[in-house]
């Protein structure tokens, strides 16, 4: 018998859309081989109407598709605006149509509801409303006009104009009469429920005089949409519920077995801890439409998503819906980096970001992923010159080691800067990856004074002590300017004694400034790296002031003045520029961006909590 | 909670036909699909059938075994799932269980279905 598994039969009505999966075994030959939907003839033959590889029949065009889900071993064929000529048999299946790789589907489309018995036919998706409406005749535009529900045999009531209301349509449900000029009266229903569908009937008096009309009611349930992501990768839910409930919390959870839906992240405040630093819920637009970006996606995240608005801020029966089956693809083309880095108090850290390689001259940016409210991303530097005030002379966002990955070097560390951080592009959104910074006790393992002065005219030599246990590692001094860190020539002073145990592989190399002038005053970075993968760095600031005796400075470690505490410091931070990453549709469109740092996206954001990796920043 | 209450199990000779009935009851939202699973003495619990349901489409699903001789149905008024089975023999022996899941997924797989019945004995002798 064929391993391809697939449902017999499928039945639907004419305009619809039918979502067909087939099951086959995810070998490593089946995952890749050609995936087909063909229609079987009646001698015998089977003919092509969709496969993996692209065709599409002219029977097809613009109405089908079929998508590959390797991971899962799985393909699904949508079909919409079907017709009646679409019933028949097919069959869904692997490889070559004529093989025994397949599975025969019955596909049944019959008329779609008419206005048979002047019933008027109402669809409306879960948790929205509908409006029926209800004619009357003149002479009864002052008798009671009232709705029933027929359940079995018997009509039961709804509402009526003498203010009944069925305890079951309590607080989602009311009666309008028209102006007098209109011989109409509506009934809106709110939040609509599966059980709300059926048939009603509305009627305008009570006698054998009344004016009656049917009304058939189907409530949809969304079928979800497919979505398919890398691991490590990231995903946004796009959720449009309508203006009606523009003013209602929005959600978004995870259906687990049953009937539970748990809370993924609300406008209320609530948030997963699975998804700690690795999600946004992008303020919503006027029209009550809102997005959800979740990165570093995790083989876990796999699973059916709803976001709804309810007041409560979860899955209540009545709340409208919009759902997504995610699945997370394990054959991943984002590279594993790691998802924690660790450095003292301090000492520095320095990050890798991958991106995809076909965008190297993309925008990169790294930002600060915030818990607060709904969480937002304030963008701290990025690849065009730009540095948060604050982050001055710490911060540097480097294009090495270059072909799908970039670095950024984080020094001066303080416990305040523990944290979430993502890497993201103006290029590809599914490129979007997180660390985390953790701050662990230790010392600084590269030695330079505090803040420096200068003379001008003078010559200045700050020095840099280098443990040996960077011994085989490229020791470089440079001075940070916003677009990055420009190299200076040094000078290797030999061994240092600077550490205690550490033998004559230690370094003391230093920076000559000869004839310092105003252009030097700034921040000047000692650090390590092997080829263009850049370890820790250390940060000396030089102040430059006019000559008071003559003759050239030699900074010591014990002469240097002592770093300002950070109180000094934040004395000294200007007020913050709002360069918060929101809106994941910014880069979507293709046009040109005045000023991103003003307006940045957030769906290029992302996080890779997908492994547990750790990489050292200053000593362990 | 989901309830599932199945009915119409039995005792009949071989090539007589029976029919299974799944009413569920309690708060239905957001069931997708209701299906049949039987489990015979000293074996595992096996997937029978399928019905799963959106809007006015729905699929059905059988095992390699039961095809052409069971037939899945649902009454969705009644919220009622019904298998009728024909041409019975005597391996098709077993307690009938009633399932129903939320999720989407492999329809076969015993996991993806979080609501199950108490289960109903069909004995089919030779």
């Known amino acids: 018998k064929s391993p391809i598994f697939g449902p017999e039969e499928v039945n639907s009505v004419e305009g619809n859309s039918v979502s067909i999966t087939c099951y086959y075994p995810p070998t490593s030959v089946n995952r890749h081989t050609r995936k087909y939907w063909c229609r079987q003839g009646a001698r015998g033959g089977c003919i092509t109407l969709i496969s993996s590889e692209g065709y599409v029949s002219s029977k097809y065009a613009g109405r089908a598709n079929l998508t590959n889900f390797p991971e899962n071993g799985t393909f699904v064929v949508n079909i919409a605006q079907l017709s009646q000529d679409d019933s028949g048999r097919y069959k869904c299946g692997l490889g070559i149509n004529s093989r025994g790789l397949s599975f025969d589907v019955s596909l049944e489309v019959s008329q779609g509801p008419g206005l048979l018995n002047d019933t008027k036919v109402y669809t409306v998706d879960l948790g929205r409303t509908v409006t029926i409406n209800c004619p009357f005749k003149t002479e009864n535009a002052q008798k009671r006009k009232s709705l029933y529900k027929q359940i079995g045999l018997y009509p039961v009531l709804v509402i009526d104009s003498s203010g009944y209301v069925n305890p079951n349509y309590t607080g989602r449900i009311r009666l309008d009469i028209q102006g007098t000029g209109q011989l109409l009266f509506s009934v809106v229903i709110n939040q609509l429920r599966l059980s709300d569908a059926g048939q009603y009937l509305c009627q305008a008096g009570d006698d054998s005089n009344s004016n009656k009309k049917n009304a058939d009611l189907q409530v949809l349930k969304p079928e979800p949409e497919l979505v398919y992501e890398d691991l490590r990768g990231s995903v946004t839910f796009h959720c449009a519920l309508g203006p009606e409930v523009a003013n209602v919390a929005k959600f978004l959870c995870r259906q687990s077995s049953g009937e539970n839906c748990d809370v993924v992240v609300n406008t209320l405040g609530k948030r997963a801890p699975a998804f700690e630093g690795r999600i946004l819920l992008n303020p919503q637009d006027k029209d009550g439409s809102f997005s959800v970006v979740i990165t570093g996606l995790r083989k876990e995240d796999a699973g059916r998503y709803l976001c709804g608005a309810h007041s409560d801020g979860q899955l209540q029966e009545g709340s409208p819906i919009q759902a997504w089956q995610l699945f997370v693809n394990e054959e991943s083309t984002i590279p594993r980096s790691p998802t924690v880095v660790k450095g003292v108090a301090g000492g520095s850290v320095a990050v890798l970001c991958p991106y995809n390689r076909k965008e190297s001259k993309s925008i990169k940016y790294w930002c600060l992923w915030e818990g607060a409210q709904n969480g937002r991303c304030p963008l701290l530097v990025d690849s065009e010159g730009w540095v948060k005030a604050q982050y001055e002379g710490r911060l540097s966002l480097l294009e090495e080691p270059g072909n799908g990955t970039f670095t950024v070097i984080l020094n001066q560390l303080t416990s305040r800067d523990a944290g979430f951080y993502w890497c993201l592009t103006n290029g590809d959104t599914l490129w979007r990856t997180t660390v985390e910074i953790k701050i662990i006790e230790g010392e600084p393992n590269l030695k330079v004074p505090g803040n420096v002065t200068a003379v001008l005219g003078e010559t200045l030599k700050v020095p840099c002590h280098f443990p040996c246990k960077f011994s085989s590692y490229e020791k470089y001094w440079c001075k940070w300017n916003n677009t990055g860190c420009q190299a200076l020539p040094s000078q290797d002073e030999g061994p240092s004694k600077a550490f205690v145990n550490c033998d004559e592989n230690s370094r003391l190399v230093s920076l000559t400034l000869n004839l310092v002038t105003r252009a030097d005053e700034g921040w000047y970075w000692c650090g390590v790296k092997q080829g263009h993968f850049y370890g820790e760095t250390a940060a000396v600031y030089v102040a430059v002031e006019e000559r008071k005796a003559a003759g050239s400075r030699d900074v010591s470690l014990a002469k240097a003045d002592a770093a300002p505490d950070e109180k000094v410091l934040d004395s000294g931070f200007r007020e913050i520029e709002n360069k918060a990453i929101q809106d994941p549709r910014l880069f979507a469109e293709e046009k040109a961006v005045a000023d991103t740092r003003d307006q940045a996206d957030g769906s290029r954001a992302s996080v890779d909590s997908g492994s547990s990796e750790e990489q050292g920043g200053s000593s362990r | 909670q989901v309830q599932l209450v199945e009915s119409g199990g039995g005792l009949v000779q071989a090539g007589d036909s029976l029919r299974l009935s799944c009413a569920a009851s309690g708060r239905t939202f957001p069931t997708y699909a209701m299906g049949w699973f039987r489990q015979a003495p000293g074996k595992e619990r096996e997937f029978v059938a399928t019905?799963?349901?959106?809007?006015?489409?729905?699929?059905?699903y059988y095992a390699d075994f039961v095809k052409g001789r069971f037939t899945i149905s649902r009454d969705n008024a009644k919220n009622t799932v019904y298998l009728q089975m024909d041409s019975l023999k005597p391996e098709d022996t077993a307690v009938y269980y009633c399932?129903?899941?939320?999720?989407?997924?492999?329809?076969?797989?015993?996991?993806?279905?979080?609501?199950w019945g108490q289960g109903t004995q069909v004995t089919v002798s030779s």
């Open positions: 399932a129903a899941t939320t999720l989407l997924g492999d329809p076969r797989a015993l996991n993806e279905y979080a609501y």
């Open positions: 019905i799963r349901w959106s809007g006015s489409t729905q699929y059905k």
